[in-house]
């Protein structure tokens, strides 16, 4: 019969070895078999599995010269990068006839340093605020035990006995580096180094110490910043009356905000230059040395209103008989607020001031007293929002009205060029 | 598999100095640290000291003063000298890793003259 | 020193028996707390590390509870094997000290 068709004679002539070595280590797996006629197929088998994709080379010699003498037949599994995934019992499998043969097995070991599956990351934390780092290591072999390092100084009295997988540090006052050193039977594997970054703390109670009509005084409490002396903190508002939601401190608005610096201390900032009756959100973050704190959440604040800066403009005033009649457009300097009428003024050489207010009217009608004989009357306009009136209008002459004529118009202020919208800020 | 072995003489003469080394195999000394601790007759366990990976130490103030641990990391040993024994010295003595997987089976001195 | 006082100094029990053994430190010692098992003419064995983790190979019969400066070892059920002296360590800082150490007997 021909050689390896009987169960009891294996055709294997030589077996797998074993490998035991350190990650990333390269190794080859050998096996060799006699057979008689056509050389079979060798395949590996892992753990009693077909390595499907096996990095295998197979090389076949004859013995004779005849296709059916024997055969020497040698299947080489080839180990790249040796990792745990690749450790297990190895063996050669051949198909001969109706018969299934196996090798005896070979061993493939993993034996090494520690590995980090785990290391510590760079962060930044907020001086004396508590955060975690993680490092986790493995074999084989195993036990692996973690000593923590802060600064190059271990933070156990021995490798195994302080924590091991997560470090809570309970906060810092400076700028740190924390390593885990992984002990096991082989060595000592060193993680790498992260650099904790201590910023200030968020800066806590903002609030509006003094609110004018283009002016709001801001104060805030510092966080603490550990062994770093704040340099300085910053600003920002934006307008918001556009409904943006930014009340809860979610989203970052829209439009660019207005930044500004102050010097600290001390900590409190006099923004300049508003919009009168105006709502802003405001925020502030300080920076040390190592860097800005987070912002504090958006806080709404409103400047108030203010009085008008300039008078009604183009007023006109006419007199027939015993009758005035008096009009004038808004006035084009800004409001700053509503408007929520005018007042008028109107007084004769010597008779005393008649004060009426008109409302939001541009226009009125005067009856004046008597027979409309009194001289040198005058006119004057303001308007008001909620703060108080605004300026005055320069006297208008009550001037007599001929058919026919247009009615006399007093520019009594000059027209100013109206601005492009601009922010000037403190 | 990891074994401890102390080695050393039996019995000390007082004001001599006690020697002994503990022999590693299946792990090396140039990771984690090594310990001794004793454990007189019939009495709780003492904590000496012990040498790191990288050589440095700690030792029991109480033993400060006459204590030295040692290591020879080509032979995967590290030692225990006591020097000034007396009486109170006598005890079972064990070596291990500083995690306390591993002990020695221990080795008693007696301090005698 | 740290101080490390344990009590009882022995206790007599049965097999199944619910035992628990506690340890106080002098000062707060965080979780840096092993308990270890010695029957005689052997080395001490590790049973609880960290206050809490059971060692390798320990049953899980035993637990370990505490932070700070008071600990506890508990045995839910008391077996055979169990009948040995036990100690606490702190390692929290140097010099490492045990405590004086719980001798369980048989009833």
């Known amino acids: 019969a021909p050689r390896g068709t009987q169960a009891e004679e294996s055709p294997f002539v030589g077996n797998p070895g074993n490998i035991t070595g350190a990650r990333g280590l390269t190794g080859t797996l050998r096996c060799q078999l006699q057979v008689q006629g056509e050389p079979p197929e060798v395949h590996w088998l892992r753990d009693g599995q077909i390595l499907e994709l096996a990095d295998s080379t197979q090389t076949q010699v004859p013995l004779g010269e005849d296709e059916q003498d024997d055969w020497i037949v040698v299947s080489q599994l080839r180990i790249t990068s040796l990792q745990l995934s690749d450790t297990g019992q190895y063996q050669c499998l051949v198909f001969l006839g109706h018969q299934t043969f196996v090798s005896q097995p070979g061993y493939v070991g993993l034996e090494g340093l520690p590995y980090f599956l785990e290391e510590p990351e760079d962060r930044t934390v907020a001086a004396n605020t508590p955060f975690n780092l993680s490092c986790q290591a493995q074999g084989p072999p195993e036990p692996v035990d973690l000593l923590w390092l802060q600064d190059a100084v271990p933070l156990a009295t021995a490798p195994g006995h302080g924590p091991q997988r997560s470090l809570h540090v309970p906060g810092l006052n400076k700028t740190s580096s924390f390593s885990c050193e992984a002990h096991n039977a082989k060595g000592v594997t060193t993680s790498r180094t992260a650099t904790i970054t201590v910023l200030p703390q968020q800066p806590r109670n903002l609030h509006l110490v003094s609110r004018q009509p283009t002016e709001l005084e801001v104060a805030w409490t510092p966080g603490l910043s550990g062994i770093y002396p704040l340099t300085h903190c910053t600003l920002q508002a934006v307008l918001s009356d556009d409904g943006m939601g930014i009340q809860a401190g979610e989203p970052d608005p829209p439009e660019e905000p207005l930044t500004s610096q102050a010097s600290v201390p001390p900590h409190q900032l006099r923004l300049g230059s508003l919009h009168p009756h105006t709502p802003y959100h405001i925020r502030v973050a300080c920076t040390s040395s190592q860097g800005p704190s987070s912002w504090t959440h958006w806080l709404p604040v409103e400047t108030p209103e203010g009085v008008p800066l300039g008078p009604p403009e183009n007023i006109s005033a006419t007199r027939n008989g015993s009758q005035a009649f008096v009009h004038w457009q808004e006035p084009r300097a800004p409001l700053q607020g509503t408007l929520l009428g005018y007042r008028l003024a109107y007084q004769g050489q010597d008779t005393p001031e008649v004060l009426m207010d008109i409302g939001l009217r541009q226009e009125v009608t005067l009856e004046l007293q008597g027979d409309g004989s009194v001289s040198n009357l005058t006119v004057c306009v303001a308007a008001y929002t909620a703060a108080g009136d605004g300026p005055w209008s320069l006297p208008v002459p009550l001037e007599a009205w001929r058919p026919g004529e247009a009615q006399p118009v007093h520019q009594l202020v000059k027209e100013p060029s109206t601005p492009a919208f601009s922010w000037p800020w403190w | 598999q990891v074994q401890l072995q102390e080695s050393g003489p039996g019995l000390v003469k007082p004001s001599e100095t006690l020697s002994l080394t503990c022999t590693v195999s299946?792990?090396?000394?140039?990771?984690?640290?090594w310990g001794w601790i004793r454990q007189p007759p019939g009495k709780g366990l003492e904590w000496i000291g012990y040498?790191?990976?990288?050589?440095?130490?700690s030792y029991n103030p109480s033993l400060k003063s006459r204590v030295t641990i040692s290591r020879d990391t080509s032979k995967n040993q590290f030692s225990l000298k006591l020097s000034s024994v007396t009486a109170a010295d006598t005890a079972v003595y064990y070596c291990?890793?500083?995690?306390?997987?591993?002990w020695g089976q221990g080795t008693l001195v007696t301090v005698s003259s | 020193d740290i101080q490390m006082t344990q009590s009882p100094s022995s206790l007599s029990a049965s097999v199944g028996d619910r035992v628990t053994i506690t340890c106080r430190a002098s000062?707060?010692?965080?979780?840096?707390l092993r308990w270890y098992q010695q029957k005689p003419g052997k080395a001490p064995k590790l049973m609880i590390s960290?206050?809490?983790n059971l060692a390798a190979g320990v049953p899980s019969r035993f637990s370990g509870s505490g932070s700070g400066s008071d600990f506890t070892l508990t045995i839910s059920s008391l077996q055979p094997e169990d009948f040995a002296t036990y100690y606490c360590?702190?390692?929290?800082?140097?010099?490492?000290?045990f405590g004086q150490g719980t001798k369980v007997e048989i009833k």
């Open positions: 040498i790191t990976y990288s050589g440095s130490t």
């Open positions: 291990a890793i500083t995690t306390f997987y591993y």
């Open positions: 960290g206050a809490t």
């Open positions: 299946g792990y090396s000394i140039t990771s984690n640290y």
């Open positions: 360590l702190q390692s929290k800082e140097s010099p490492w000290t």
């Open positions: 000062q707060d010692i965080g979780n840096y």
